[in-house]
Interface confidence: low
């Protein structure tokens, strides 16, 4: 986590040192993409430019001064959402030659006011680039608790740029845009969202057709080219601008590490808390045992006699009892060997009553400090009781 880089995001837009946030966008041949860009202060020219391979300059594709580059005429639109501090550039009828590096920006000089870099990759919908490399599986422990899981249709995060392809894959008549800019029919373009469930659902990752998975999961997955903005794993391109407000703005770059940090802190806190509790329990128990030992010795030994040799080892592992066993712990006293003198009736040293309430089971911490996963805690059937026979 490069925390030291954060201040660079806040350098002035024109700052030469400024590190541009990068977004990867996947588009389908013939489909369309919407590139989401941060909108700085109002009343300034904003634009999307394309980096020229040879010269390294950025040629304007579309800008608010009504300029549209020749090869994008009729298939690019720029819309501003000042209240959300963003502007959107939609490019329709994608072709392979649209693949390349673009940049959003603001200001009169296209090359100077860049605010975000965008890499667009146009491919067949069957074989997007992120699918080529198998994605590392999320470790089991990393799966988010139910509480954190957002519905699959949660709108995308800043890094998840919408890629529009057809909505219903069923036999729905296409909805045509009156606008001349859109010659691709997405069926039907229901507020830019697509519930892509086709005649033949394909099986990419979980399914290549529904939504962008939860935004949170997106935050937690690496933004690598192979995964890039895909949390679009599933190809829904839902972009509900209404629900976006909390996540727009460039401050979003900080949100990711912050959430991750908080998440990890919480985990750490839990682990530490549990460890501390265990230690306390251990020392309490050790003290109690010592006290009991002394009590036993004094009560069982005739004054001058030596300590009995066959005292049951109080530190041996707790006996595991069947689930129904009495919580008070009527343990099995060892049967004395033939001819052995009968010991006095076993003394039941029960821990304080609360310790044996069935709902408060604990493990034999003094035997093993192994950390049980939370899910297992409730299920532990090793009741904690101490049976000290004479």
């Amino acid at each position: 986590m490069d925390f030291w880089l954060w201040p660079l995001y806040f350098l002035p837009v024109s700052g030469a040192l400024r590190i541009l946030p990068e977004v990867k966008v996947e588009g389908e041949l013939g489909g369309s993409v919407t590139i989401k860009c941060p909108l700085p202060e109002m009343h300034v020219r904003i634009y999307l430019c394309r980096e020229m391979a040879g010269s390294g300059t950025c040629g304007t594709v579309v800008s608010t001064t009504n300029f549209i580059k020749a090869e994008y005429k009729g298939r690019v639109t720029l819309k501003q959402y000042p209240r959300k501090n963003l502007f959107l550039v939609e490019v329709t009828q994608l072709t392979e030659s649209d693949s390349g590096v673009y940049a959003c920006g603001a200001g009169m000089n296209t090359d100077r006011g860049k605010t975000q870099k965008v890499t667009l990759n146009v491919h067949s919908e069957y074989e997007p680039s992120w699918e080529e490399q198998p994605m590392p599986e999320t470790p089991k422990w990393f799966h988010l608790p139910y509480l954190f899981q957002m519905p699959a249709y949660a709108s995308s995060s800043k890094f998840v740029t919408r890629v529009t392809t057809p909505a219903q894959r069923g036999k729905v008549p296409p909805v045509h845009h009156s606008s001349p800019t859109t010659q691709i029919t997405h069926r039907p373009r229901v507020s830019r969202a697509s519930s892509v469930a086709g005649d033949k659902p394909r099986t990419f990752l979980p399914s290549t057709t529904a939504s962008k998975i939860s935004a949170l999961e997106g935050l937690l997955k690496p933004q690598t080219p192979s995964y890039n903005h895909h949390t679009r794993l599933h190809r829904q391109r839902a972009l509900d601008y209404g629900s976006q407000s909390g996540r727009e703005g460039q401050g979003f770059h900080i949100l990711i590490p912050t959430i991750l940090g908080l998440f990890l802190l919480a985990l750490l806190g839990l682990v530490v808390k549990r460890a501390v509790e265990r230690r306390k329990a251990l020392s309490r128990r050790a003290r109690r045992l010592a006290v009991r030992m002394r009590a036993l010795e004094s009560s069982q030994r005739p004054r001058g006699s030596p300590r009995p040799r066959s005292q049951n080892n109080i530190y041996s592992a707790c006996p595991r009892r069947a689930r129904g066993a009495d919580a008070a712990g009527t343990g099995e006293a060892p049967v004395p060997g033939p001819g052995a003198p009968l010991p006095p009736a076993p003394l039941q040293v029960s821990e304080s009553p609360w310790l044996h309430a069935p709902s408060l089971k604990t493990s034999c911490e003094y035997v093993s400090l192994y950390h049980q996963p939370a899910a297992m805690m409730e299920d532990s059937d090793s009741d904690d009781y101490i049976n000290v026979p004479a």
Epitope: E125, E127, Q183, G198
Partner: antibody, heavy 122, light 107 residues
Framework: QVQLVQSGAEVKKPGASVKVSCKAS????????VNWVRQATGQGLEWMGW????????GYAQKFQGRVTMTRNTSIGTAYMELNSLTSDDTAVYYC???????????????WGHGTTVTVSS | EIVLTQSPATLSLSPGERATLSCRAS??????LAWYQQKPGQAPRLLIY???NRATGIPARFSGSGSGTDFTLTISSLEPEDFAVYYC?????????FGQGTKVEIK
């Protein structure tokens, strides 16, 4: 063998609609895009649009926007092209042609239907 | 849209001769250009795709070259069955467009 079989010739009145079918045989319809190209008598080839039969995605040339609809029925492996508001200028041979494959290789329009002649006349 | 201009409109040659057909794009189409052959009453047939790749089953006498805006289809030695109309087609930008065709006829 791999082929695209198109429906028979049609004669239509101006203002009417025509729906041409294109059945894939020798391969699965959903494995390749379907393109539609028309050719007026003695003229060149004119690309009308494209459809991904797997998804239903379509892309139409501006000239035909709002007048053409490309659909498919995957269960019978058939693609359709419907053209509305016909005029005499739409009199042509309409071809369906197989395009890009599902593994994203593009081999050009490598398989063509035999063509369907549509005559628009009052 | 990208306009493809083919030249010459008609090419009169004898069997065994070399035919060179040209296709020029109004703007760069990279190498996204294909060539088709069409005989009267038949559907077009793909010869070359992506500027220089021969389609399956196409004889070696057909070759394509070029990139950007200038492309060439060469038939090294004309066979009687090669006399037909040849079209170039770009798939770089939408809409895909075809050239107006070059007719190769027997001299």
């Amino acid at each position: 063998q791999v082929q695209l079989v198109q429906s028979g010739a049609e004669v239509k009145k101006p203002g009417a609609s025509v729906k041409v079918s294109c059945k894939a045989s020798g391969y699965t319809l959903t494995s390749y895009d379907v393109n539609w190209v028309r050719q007026a008598t003695g003229q060149g080839l004119e690309w009308m649009g494209w459809m991904n039969p797997n998804s239903g995605n379509t892309g139409y040339a501006q000239k035909f926007q709002g007048r053409v609809t490309m659909t498919r029925n995957t269960s019978i492996g058939t693609a359709y092209m419907e053209l509305n508001s016909l005029t005499s200028d739409d009199t042509a041979v309409y071809y369906c042609a197989r395009g890009r494959s599902i593994i994203n290789h593009y081999y050009g329009l490598d398989v063509w239907g035999h063509g369907t002649t549509v005559t628009v006349s009052s | 849209e990208i306009v493809l201009t083919q030249s010459p409109a008609t090419l009169s040659l004898s069997p065994g001769e070399r035919a060179t057909l040209s296709c020029r794009a109004s703007q760069s189409v990279s190498s996204y250009l294909a060539w088709y052959q069409q005989k009267p009453g038949q559907a077009p047939r793909l010869l070359i795709y992506d500027a220089s790749n021969r389609a399956t089953g196409i004889p070696a006498r057909f070759s394509g070259s070029g990139s950007g805006t200038d492309f060439t289809l060469t038939i090294s030695s004309l066979e009687p069955e090669d006399f037909a109309v040849y079209y170039c087609q770009q798939r770089s930008n939408w809409p895909w467009t075809f050239g107006q065709g070059t007719k190769v006829e027997i001299k």
